[in-house]
């Protein structure tokens, strides 16, 4: 089940997904579509980013946070009842199998008839609560000398998207998070 | 030493079923994402399917998707290749291969030939 | 996906000379945060699964003699044996994990002269 967010016609609509770089300038490809993630990449792709900067975007979808902090949520403005529907967040962390994904929902409603005096967005789902594991090493002993820095030992996110964590064995090593919400 | 011994290869007719299984000794299974990857005759290495270490996710080519299923049985040091559907483009020697920590196959198990054919 | 692509299909070398295997991928496979190129050699000898043989570009498995080695960065890619030998007769595939499912190049047959 994804989490759901709204926001109304004619507004901006914010979609949250966040990592902490292992280390500063750390940056992990992203990329953002329209879809639930598939199996790798992702479908109806908006927007992606590299290790070093923002590499693909359509008009309307903007990363407004400072992705090099790993703030990669999406905003799509003055979003259209078209525009419901699930979204996928996909870290692509280099690896076989090592990508994180959530789906997000977002739900577009009419705009009120009557303003609302200062609020720009209604978010009902807005900031959900938060789970965080701990991986526990692989029983075996393995040369961590050859492997590459960008390991996560934390990840933080939704109880219902926490399933597998998909950082196979190793990948817990480095007090990286990664977190939607 | 790690070693994986591979069973339940043959031959089957198209639209047929068969189901691979690879036996692990040496290492713990669970502690470990896993693949198979097959090669049909005379040609080179093709990705099928690969599955995380508690078995909890699960990744398949294109080609074969929504035909074959990965799946561990950890208590029994096993990886498993459920295959449904099978065209003649499937026949292959089929190999499950250990992944290294997310990385790279280090270790293989001796094949097994899959064929379909009427 | 990445695309490998190995050069050339197949190579006769003679017994004790050099023999040299391009590998291209077709997007960038090095990772700058730890500066590693995510792509790994494999030998297999006919009737055999393939044997890992190089990692992160030239790194050499256990075991591997140091008459093979690996170099390149980004896309372009190099495995060499420096001095040929008789069991060295196989096909050698490029593979990289860098991102989507791995893949690896066509293979390369190595053959004595």
């Known amino acids: 089940s994804e989490v759901e967010y709204r926001a109304e016609v004619g507004q901006n609509a914010y979609l949250p997904c966040f990592y902490t770089p292992a280390a500063p300038g750390n940056l992990v490809p992203v990329c953002w579509g329209k879809g639930a993630c598939p199996v790798f990449q992702c479908t109806n792709e908006l927007l992606r980013t590299d290790e070093r900067d923002v590499n693909y975007w359509t008009s309307r979808y903007w990363l407004n946070g400072d992705f090099r902090k790993g703030d990669v949520s999406l905003t799509i403005e003055n979003v259209t009842l078209a525009d419901s529907g699930i979204y996928c967040c996909r870290i692509q962390i280099p690896g076989i199998m090592n990508d994180e994904k959530f789906n997000l929902k977002l739900v577009i409603k009419p705009a009120k008839v009557t303003p609302a005096p200062t609020r720009q967005r209604d978010f009902t789902a807005a900031f959900p609560r938060m789970l965080t594991t701990r991986g526990h090493g692989p029983a075996e002993t393995q040369t961590l000398g050859s492997l590459p820095d960008i390991n996560l030992t934390q990840i933080s996110t939704l109880a219902n998207e926490l399933r597998d964590s998909r950082l196979a064995n190793d990948l817990r090593d480095s007090g990286a998070t990664i977190r939607i919400g | 030493q790690v070693q994986l011994q591979q069973s339940g290869g043959g031959l089957v007719q198209p639209g047929g079923s068969l189901r691979l299984s690879c036996a692990a000794s040496g290492f713990t299974l669970s502690s470990y994402a896993m693949s198979w990857v097959r090669q049909a005759p005379g040609k080179g290495l093709e990705w099928v399917s690969g599955?995380?270490?508690?078995?909890?996710?699960?990744y398949n080519a294109d080609s074969v998707k929504g035909r074959f299923t990965i799946s561990r049985d950890n208590s029994k040091n096993t990886l498993f290749l459920q295959m449904n559907s099978l065209r003649a483009e499937d026949t292959a020697v089929y190999y499950c291969?250990?992944?290294?920590?997310?990385?790279?196959?280090?270790?293989w198990g001796q094949g097994t030939l899959v064929t379909v054919s009427s | 996906e990445i695309v490998m692509t190995q050069s050339p299909d197949s190579l006769a070398v003679s017994l004790g000379e050099r023999a040299t295997i391009n590998c291209k991928s077709s997007?960038?496979?090095?990772?700058?945060?730890?500066?590693?190129?995510?792509l790994a050699w494999y030998q297999q000898k006919p009737g055999q699964p393939p044997k890992l043989l190089i990692y992160w570009t030239s790194t050499r498995e256990s075991g591997v003699p140091n008459r093979f080695s690996g170099s390149g960065s980004g896309t372009d890619f190099t495995l060499t044996i420096s001095s040929l030998q008789a069991e060295d007769v196989a096909v050698y595939y490029c593979q990289q994990y860098y991102s989507g499912p791995p893949t690896f190049g066509q293979g390369t047959k190595v053959e004595i002269k």
């Open positions: 997007q960038s496979v090095l990772y700058s945060s730890n500066n590693k190129n995510y």
């Open positions: 291969a250990k992944i290294f920590g997310s990385y790279y196959f280090d270790y």
């Open positions: 599955i995380s270490g508690s078995g909890g996710s699960t």
